[in-house]
Amino acid sequence: QFLKEGQLAAGTCEIVTLDRDSSQPRIEERSQTARCACRKGQIAGTTRARPACVDARIIKTKQWCDMLPCLEGEGCDLLINRSGWTCTQPGGRIKTTTVS
């Protein structure tokens, strides 16, 4: 039961950085995406501000804060209509994430 090269362990995620040269000289675009191999009953989500496999029922009910999406010490609050969540740092700075 060894993993093949490039294969993710079940229940884990990795961040994939896509580099591509733009048509403009000396400008490089970088974008990040997550690759997850989630177990049965799980779905790709966010835990501690990183990609993670989370309980699929959290996504179904839109109880986003149940993913523990914020860093430890930050407060999580649902956006109105459960369209996403906010993470509030101890200093008061707020980071908002919306789910499309």
Partner: antibody, heavy 113, light 107 residues
């Protein structure tokens, strides 16, 4: 960062009992909180878990026998109708990924006439 | 429902020796396995998560391995303070499940 359970005592069978878990040094809303018990000289039994929203999941044997609830500062475990089989040390423990990184010292519940 | 069979139930080891404890899962748990140490009158303490990830502050003589349904905790160069009961725990799905425990005595 620590957890502490309270409320354990000698109760008569059928008398509901509520145990309380209090966290120090971290916010309960940033973790999944669990209750685990251990009968004298026996192994560990997971009772259930509560999410920040209040969503709960229980072990099959624990459904109907226990209720987990929370406030902003505590997590409670209610033993609805204790029997002698519920005599045990009850621990609260926190998790993010399914394993328990911090445990309370435990509180002893004795059910006897 | 996941069942974890932990063997042996108890063992005796000499200081400096090696201890091996096994945990057999009734189904593939995809390396979602943790190990705990518990001493009398105390709560368990986490030693290893994710089959082989040593917790901060845990001596390197403790190690974990395995995959699929078979997992092992090894204590190399056993010390007197390692006398305790050891539990495995699976967390691939609910309900979270513990093995029955292995009591380790040091001679």
């Amino acid at each position: 960062q620590s957890l502490e359970e309270s409320g354990g005592r000698l109760v008569t069978p059928g008398t509901p009992l509520t145990l309380t878990c209090t966290a120090s040094g971290f916010s309960l809303s940033s973790y999944y909180m669990n209750w685990v018990r251990q009968a004298p000289g026996k192994g560990l039994e997971w009772i259930g878990i509560i999410y920040p929203s209040g969503t709960t999941y229980y072990a099959g044997w624990a459904k109907g026998r226990f209720t987990i609830s929370k406030t902003s500062t505590t997590v409670d475990l209610k033993i609805t109708s204790p029997t002698s089989e519920d005599t045990a040390t009850y621990f609260c423990a926190r998790t993010v990924s399914g394993y328990f990184d911090i445990w309370g010292p435990g509180t002893l519940v004795t059910v006897s006439l | 429902e996941l069942d974890l069979t932990q063997t042996p139930p108890s063992l005796s080891a000499s200081v400096g020796g090696t201890v091996t404890i096994n945990c057999l899962a009734s189904e593939d748990i995809y390396s979602a396995l943790a190990w705990y140490q518990q001493k009398p009158g105390k709560p368990p303490t986490l030693l290893i998560s994710g089959t082989s990830n040593l917790e901060s502050g845990v001596p390197p003589r403790f190690s974990g391995s395995g995959s699929g349904t078979d997992y092992t905790l090894t204590i190399g160069g056993v010390q007197a303070e390692d006398a305790a009961t050891y539990f495995c725990q699976g967390y691939s799905s609910y309900p979270l499940t513990f093995g029955a425990g292995t009591n380790v005595e040091i001679k």
